[in-house]
């Protein structure tokens, strides 16, 4: 299993990750947002509400 | 393939502005920061600013504040550079630069000339 | 404003020889160093980030080193394809080029 080599992202890049935790992946030359719970998106720009809707009728 | 393209020359008289336009392909710019990096003939690198094209917010250098203007096009995938009261010494060759999901890659770079 | 001390502006060296450039930043950039080498015409290349990572394709005869404030380049044996002008550029707190070291053969 290859190793990656990862620290916290530069202060260069604040505000970068909107909704998560910014890493740089050294060996990779970027930086990866780690997103909080309910955010998507490269950057965790994206809100999603995962709904769990109960059975319909037809399926009782 | 990523690529940033760069608008092509320009030659422009002292006082006028100038906008130069860098297109992303392969890539989204709201993934992205892009920066402009500036190269006077025969003489080093100069970094002027920077575009969070997802939120327009911007960061420039003291020394280029007020006459330098870094926006982004999200819906074409374009950041432009203006930079207003030409004068001889912004004779430079100006690189767009992204930064973010991948460190640092160029455009190719664009000549302006400043020239009466 | 971060500022990047580059020494020395140039540098003439024999082929073969060990080649080192260096970077002092006016404060602490936490290692958050990458080297550029430009030819001329040409856009600069990435060589080396992160002080000592070294780019997929760059020869390891290549290297970085330091931390804190300041920071070294090397060309461990030069070759004549490296005669370039080579930048080092601090990304902690936006971005400083340092002046460029140009570096020719004897």
């Known amino acids: 299993v290859a190793q990656v080599s990862i620290t916290k992202c530069s202060s260069d890049m604040n505000g970068y990750c909107l909704h998560g935790q910014c890493i740089y992946l050294v060996d990779m030359s970027q930086n990866y947002c780690r997103c909080e719970v309910g955010y998507t998106g490269v950057r965790c720009e994206h809100f999603f509400l995962t709904v769990h809707q109960p059975l319909s009728k037809e399926y009782v | 393939q990523d690529q940033l393209v760069q608008s092509g020359a320009e030659v422009k008289k002292p006082g006028a502005s100038v906008k130069v336009s860098c297109k992303a392909s392969?890539?989204?710019?709201?993934?992205?920061?892009i920066q402009w990096v500036r190269q006077a003939p025969g003489q080093g690198l100069e970094w002027m600013g920077r575009?969070?094209?997802?939120?327009?917010?911007?960061k420039y250098v003291p020394k280029f504040e007020g006459r330098v203007t870094i926006t982004a096009d999200t819906s074409t995938n374009t950041a432009y550079m203006e930079l207003s009261s030409l004068r001889s010494e912004d004779t430079a060759v100006y690189y767009c630069?992204?930064?973010?999901?991948?460190?640092?890659?160029w455009g190719q770079g664009t000549l302006v000339t400043v020239s009466s | 404003d971060i500022q990047m001390t580059q020494s020395p502006s140039s540098l003439s060296a024999s082929v073969g020889d060990r080649v080192t450039i260096t970077c002092k930043a006016s404060?602490?950039?936490?290692?958050?160093i990458a080297w550029y080498q430009q030819k001329p015409g040409q856009a600069p290349r990435l060589l080396i980030q992160?002080?000592?990572t070294l780019q997929p394709g760059v020869p390891s005869r290549f290297s970085g080193s330091g931390s804190g404030t300041d920071y070294t380049f090397t060309i461990s044996s030069l070759q004549p394809e490296d005669i370039a002008t080579y930048y080092c550029l601090q990304y902690d707190n936006l971005r400083t080029f340092g002046g460029g070291t140009k570096v020719e053969i004897k």
């Open positions: 992160y002080t000592s």
């Open positions: 392969g890539f989204n710019i709201k993934d992205t920061y």
């Open positions: 575009i969070d094209p997802l939120n327009g917010n911007t």
């Open positions: 630069v992204r930064s973010g999901t991948l460190f640092d890659f």
């Open positions: 404060q602490d950039i936490h290692k958050y």
